[in-house]
C-alpha cells in the first residue's frame, strides 16, 4: 500500500499558486506524484509522475472554488488522492507593495506600487483585481517603538513637517476594506530628513 502525500497545502502569493506537499516515508523506493485539478467535472493532470513535492497552479481562474488533488505513486501502485479546495481571489496572500521614498528637506515623499501578478500583463496588478484596494502606511522614528499609521487616498503620500536631521522608517501594505483583509508589510525603508525648509524672518 502506497501512503498518501502529507501536509498538502496551497501556497499562494499574488496568484502564484503552488500546491505543496511532503513525501511520506516509504521503504520500497522513491515515490512520484501526480497533481490534478477539477475542470468541468473532469480531473485534468497538471503535474504527472513528478519527483518534486510541489505543482504550479497559477494558470487557474482567479475566480471560484477549485478542487485540487495529489497522490503518491510507486511502480503500478498508488495512494488515495488527497483533496483540497482553493479559491484564489479569497485565499491568495497579498504580497508587499513596492515603495519609492525620496527625502525633500523635512518631508518624505512616497510612491507606492501595487504587487504584480503571476501570469498577467505587466500593468495588470493586484489593484486591478480588487476594486477596494488601498494602502496602509506606517512610519516611526528610527530607534523608537511608537508607530503612526495613515491610509493614503492615492498611490503617493507625503509626510510633512518631520523633525530635521532625523531618520524615519516607513513601510506599506495593501489593504482591502471590503474584505477586511490586509497584505504583507514591505521591508522598512529608512531615510534621514535634512534641514527644516522654513526660512527665518
Amino acid at each position: 500500500m502506497v501512503p498518501p502525500p502529507e501536509n498538502v497545502r496551497m501556497n499562494s502569493v499574488n496568484f502564484k499558486n503552488i500546491l505543496q506537499w511532503e513525501s511520506p516515508a516509504f521503504a520500497k523506493g522513491n515515490l512520484t506524484f501526480t497533481a490534478q485539478y477539477l475542470s468541468y467535472r473532469i480531473f485534468q493532470d497538471k503535474c504527472m509522475n513528478t519527483t518534486l513535492t510541489e505543482c504550479d497552479f497559477s494558470s487557474l481562474s482567479k475566480y471560484g472554488d477549485h478542487t485540487l488533488r495529489v497522490r503518491a505513486e510507486f511502480a503500478d501502485e498508488h495512494s488515495d488522492w488527497v483533496n483540497i479546495t482553493f479559491c484564489p481571489v479569497d485565499d491568495t496572500i497579498i504580497g508587499p507593495p513596492g515603495m519609492q521614498v525620496e527625502v525633500l528637506a523635512d518631508s518624505l515623499h512616497m510612491r507606492f506600487l501595487a504587487p504584480k501578478i503571476e501570469n498577467e500583463y505587466e500593468t495588470w496588478t493586484m489593484k486591478n483585481v480588487y476594486n477596494s484596494w488601498t494602502y496602509n502606511v506606517q512610519y516611526w522614528k528610527n530607534g523608537t517603538d511608537e508607530k503612526f499609521q495613515i491610509t493614503p487616498q492615492y498611490d503617493f503620500e507625503v509626510l510633512r513637517n518631520l523633525e530635521p536631521w532625523t531618520t524615519y522608517c516607513v513601510q506599506v501594505r495593501g489593504f482591502l476594506p471590503d474584505r477586511n483583509k490586509a497584505g504583507e508589510w514591505s521591508e522598512p525603508v529608512c531615510e534621514q530628513t535634512t534641514h527644516d525648509e522654513t526660512v527665518p524672518s
Partner: nanobody, 124 residues
Framework: EVQLVESGGGLVQPGGSLRLSCAAS????????IGWFRQAPGKGLEGVSC????????HYADSVKGRFTISRDNSKNTLYLQMNSLRAEDTAVYYC?????????????????WGQGTQVTVSS
C-alpha cells in the same frame, strides 16, 4: 447564450495595418473585462490585450506594445483591435473574449465567453 463575433481579419503585407472588431450578437459588450487572444499555427493561445471597464485601463503583451491598440465603442457595443506595423509573427487566429468577473486580463482561464476567431495572415 452570449455569442461574440469577430471580423476584420485578412491577408496583409508586413508593415501594414488591420482593424479587428468584436460584437456581441443581440447583447451589449458590457463586461468587466474584454480581451483579445491569438493562436499562431501549432502554438498555444496567447493573450494580446485587454480593456477593463472599471477604469478603462488598457493592457498589452510585450510583443504588441506600441503597435496594437485596444478600444471599445459603447454606443456600438463593439470592441476593436487596431494593429499597425504588422509582422509575420503576428500571423494567427485572433479571438475576442469576455470575462464575467473581471479579475484577470491575460489568462484564458479568467474568461467566460469566446468568439469563433478571425484569421490574420501577414505575408508578402
Amino acid at each position: 447564450e452570449v455569442q461574440l463575433v469577430e471580423s476584420g481579419g485578412g491577408l496583409v503585407q508586413p508593415g501594414g495595418s488591420l482593424r479587428l472588431s468584436c460584437a456581441a450578437s443581440g447583447n451589449s459588450l458590457d463586461y468587466p473585462t474584454i480581451g483579445w487572444f491569438r493562436q499562431a499555427p501549432g502554438k498555444g493561445l496567447e493573450g494580446v490585450s485587454c480593456i477593463s471597464a472599471s477604469d478603462a485601463s488598457t493592457h498589452y503583451a510585450d510583443s504588441v506594445k506600441g503597435r496594437f491598440t485596444i478600444s471599445r465603442d459603447n454606443s456600438k457595443n463593439t470592441l476593436y483591435l487596431q494593429m499597425n506595423s504588422l509582422r509575420a509573427e503576428d500571423t494567427a487566429v485572433y479571438y475576442c473574449a469576455a470575462s464575467l468577473h473581471g479579475l484577470g486580463c491575460k489568462s484564458e482561464a479568467d474568461y467566460d465567453y469566446w468568439g469563433q476567431g478571425t484569421q490574420v495572415t501577414v505575408s508578402s
